[in-house]
């Protein structure tokens, strides 16, 4: 028997520095977690103790903090090189700055193979990107060889900016011939490493003949066997065992997100490459693990540029940006409109001639808007200003919801109106009218939504049985502020870009902004 240790990360999302327990900015260092310096300590400890170790990343290193905003992926290549990753799969967020924003900082600089079997380049891009990422890589590990086959969410064109010259094929269809090829070349230990979410990971384990282990990402899935060490609730045991269609037991793993855990899976293979046993657990990277001094020093050196960036002007406002709780928790506020407009703008994807865009709607809890911005400071808006407005380090995500769920959400928005509570929704691409004289749960008297399948966008009444795409904060997608119906009833959830980054990009693009209060949210006569 031959034993392999797989160390894995996924959805790190630019958390190069240690973070608080909820993966936001580290405040009390003695209680902080993760970060590449701490990760390196643990990885090196395991490499020294065990003979056959692979360090893998299942995608979405890009996007999430000011590190990515400033360094644009160069930080990913640099620190992943320093940690000596063995392979990485492309995630959807690796395309956030377009193909060039992937090629130059990451693909050309990474000293580890970057993989995806289901992304095919065409046209002029084919020769430019040739060899910069691979469908698979065969790695010598100890006395054996291991094949790593990559995959990426086929939804990437709707979630990011891969352009028109990359085709995202069905994962299973694309993986099978690559695995078959490796088998014919006597590679009998094969890991599928990819970024399509836990449901697809399980399908790959079930359907792709010859895959021995699946290491996934995208859905931020936390798996654990035994008593979990922090706040995350396990979605299943680690590893999650799938019985394949040809009767094999295939371990599937994922390691939550944000570099908080290091996935640790031990696999035992027989001489024919069959998995005999698999066991392990994610390792919580808490403060009991010291940060590696040399990596930490490097982080501090790279940090300097971030501090300078946060005070530079992004753009100007010529109006007061009303982000006060007195406004945003009670009525339409122009800060809410600005943020929602930025959220929609960030999700413009012309992927189908029938649609002007794939999504037109935004909702945003008023309680998530934490500060106004005064225009009387020469109109200057900085990252620092935006960090005061959006201090929680969240993301603006894409969900699919039925109209009936949206209706419930808007009822929840005003179910206890008047108490300055955070659930009051700011909107984009939506016209809502409330009648507060009616009883809670029956206060939405009009709800019109902007069409997407149209050449001239216009507002139509919400249809209860129709499925709609909506951009919203991850806080809401996870049921925050009492929006349990969103969490329980959403049909799809894809994590998006860092909130501040979305707004800062929009402001930089517009240069001068003047958001108005324009009648998106109304109260019917006599009730307000």
């Amino acid at each position: 028997a031959w034993e392999l240790t797989i160390l894995h990360t996924n959805d790190v999302h630019s958390r190069l520095e240690q973070t608080s327990e909820d993966s936001s900015k580290c405040v009390n260092a003695s209680r902080c977690m993760g970060g590449v310096a701490r990760l390196f300590t643990k990885v090196q400890q395991i490499r020294r103790a065990e003979p056959n170790v692979l360090l893998l990343d299942a995608g979405d290193q890009y996007q999430g903090t000011i590190w990515f905003t400033v360094y644009k992926g160069a930080e990913v290549a640099h620190f992943m090189n320093a940690l000596r990753y063995d392979a990485m799969a492309l995630g959807n967020h690796e395309f956030d700055n377009g193909v060039e924003g992937l090629i130059e900082p990451l693909l050309k600089e990474a000293k580890f193979p970057i993989l995806s079997a289901n992304i095919k380049a065409k046209g002029p891009l084919a020769s430019q990107i040739s060899g910069l990422y691979l469908p698979y890589k065969v790695l010598p590990v100890g006395d054996e060889v291991v094949g790593i086959v990559g995959y990426t969410s086929k939804e990437t064109p709707f979630l990011s900016n891969p352009g028109t010259n990359l085709v995202f094929e069905d994962e299973i269809t694309a993986l099978q011939p690559e695995v078959d090829k490796l088998k014919t070349l006597n590679v009998n230990k094969i890991i599928a490493l990819g970024h399509s979410g836990f449901e697809m990971d399980k399908l790959i384990a079930q359907k792709v003949r010859g895959v021995d282990v699946v290491v996934g990402g995208h859905s931020n899935t936390f798996l654990y066997t035994g008593n979990p060490p922090s706040k995350e609730v396990p979605a299943g045991k680690y590893p999650f065992i799938v019985t394949s269609d040809d009767g094999r037991k295939v371990p599937v793993v994922q390691a939550y997100a944000f570099g908080k855990y290091l996935g640790y899976l031990k696999i035992e293979f027989d001489e024919r490459g069959n998995v005999i046993s698999s066991h392990g657990n994610p390792i919580l990277l808490n403060s009991s693990i010291p940060e590696d001094p040399s990596i930490k020093a490097d982080i501090n050196k790279w940090r300097i540029k971030l501090d300078n960036y946060s005070t530079q002007e992004l753009g100007k406002t010529i109006v007061y940006l009303d982000g006060s709780s007195q406004s945003c928790r009670f009525r339409e506020c122009n800060m809410g409109n600005l943020i929602c407009d930025a959220m929609i703008n960030n999700n413009l994807r012309h992927t189908d001639e029938m649609f002007w865009n794939h999504v037109s709607m935004c909702i945003l809890n008023g309680g998530g808007i934490r500060s106004p911005i005064d225009e009387r400071n020469n109109g200057t808006i900085t990252w620092e200003n935006l960090a005061a407005v959006l201090p929680f380090g969240g993301t603006f995500d894409l969900v699919q919801l039925k109209g009936s769920t949206l209706k419930k959400a808007f009822e929840h928005s005003v179910h206890r109106y008047g108490q300055s509570t955070g659930e009051f929704l700011q909107v984009g691409g939506i016209h809502v009218v409330y009648d507060l004289s009616r009883k809670p749960g029956d206060r939405v008297v009009k709800l019109d939504v902007l069409c997407t399948k149209c050449r001239v966008p216009s507002y139509d009444p919400l249809k209860m049985d129709e499925v709609y795409k909506v951009i919203l904060p991850n806080f809401l997608a996870n049921g925050g502020d009492g929006f349990q119906m969103i969490k329980d009833e959403l049909l799809r959830h894809d994590s998006g870009d860092q909130d501040i980054n979305v707004v800062s990009t929009y402001i930089s693009k517009m240069k001068v902004i003047y958001p108005a209060v324009e009648g998106r949210i109304k109260f019917s006569t006599g009730s307000h």
Partner: antibody, heavy 118, light 107 residues
Framework: QVQLVQSGAEVKKPGASVKVSCKAS????????MDWVRQAPGQRLEWMGD????????IYNQKFKGRVTITRDTSASTAYMELSSLRSEDTAVYYC???????????WGQGTLVTVSS | DIQMTQSPSSLSASVGDRVTITCKAS??????LSWYQQKPGKAPKLLIY???RLIDGVPSRFSGSGSGTDFTLTISSLQPEDFATYYC?????????FGQGTKLEIK
């Protein structure tokens, strides 16, 4: 700068064994795999095997059917290639070569001529 | 094992010429191809890896292209020091295999 310095030329009788050394300097020895390649007179290059100096793991070209053994001494930053049951067709220049992150051979030793003759 | 076939086996050219050497693999090698230059009595020197990535310090007149099974090494303007034997090698799978070499001679 990276340097790989190999041991000197050897003359061996058929059936004997030869052990060639390769001393590495200018980089962290355990950070890169070391391959061994040979070149018989007028022939193409032939890959023999690979060692991971970090854990001693080896992968061999099956053509050499247990005749080749690659080892390393990390304290001396040196890799070794031993070829046993020598025959006249093993007469060749033997090279060690460091592999880069992608497993292409980026630095080569100067070569060691092994002559097998009765 | 994957067979690597180079063409031509030998080639005569003059300083300033543009020269192309091809290498064909017996099956798809996933861009895992390198090119080496070897001068008489010397060890091979890596020029290009991953089919088209030029090694630091190698003159930009050398370039690599190709994917799948067909690959090309191009020298855009031959210099006197470029006369040597060139080898391609696949490192996609084990065992690693080399082409038979292309000897580039002065016309």
């Amino acid at each position: 700068q990276v340097q790989l310095v190999q041991s000197g030329a050897e003359v061996k009788k058929p059936g004997a064994s030869v052990k060639v050394s390769c001393k590495a300097s200018g980089y962290t020895f355990t950070d890169s795999n070391m391959d061994w390649v040979r070149q018989a007179p007028g022939q193409r290059l032939e890959w023999m095997g690979d060692i991971n100096p970090n854990n001693g793991g080896t992968i061999y070209n099956q053509k050499f059917k247990g005749r080749v053994t690659i080892t390393r001494d990390t304290s001396a930053s040196t890799a070794y290639m031993e070829l046993s049951s020598l025959r006249s067709e093993d007469t060749a220049v033997y090279y060690c070569a460091r592999t880069n992150w992608d497993y292409a051979m980026d630095y080569w030793g100067q070569g060691t001529l092994v002559t097998v003759s009765s | 094992d994957i067979q690597m076939t180079q063409s031509p086996s030998s080639l005569s050219a003059s300083v300033g010429d543009r020269v192309t050497i091809t290498c064909k693999a017996s099956q798809d090698i996933n861009s895992q191809l390198s090119w080496y230059q070897q001068k008489p009595g010397k060890a091979p020197k890596l020029l290009i890896y991953r089919a088209n990535r030029l090694i630091d310090g190698v003159p930009s007149r050398f370039s690599g292209s190709g994917s799948g099974t067909d690959f090309t090494l191009t020298i855009s303007s031959l210099q006197p020091e470029d006369f040597a034997t060139y080898y391609c090698q696949q490192y996609d799978v084990f065992p690693r295999t080399f082409g038979q070499g292309t000897k580039l001679e002065i016309k």
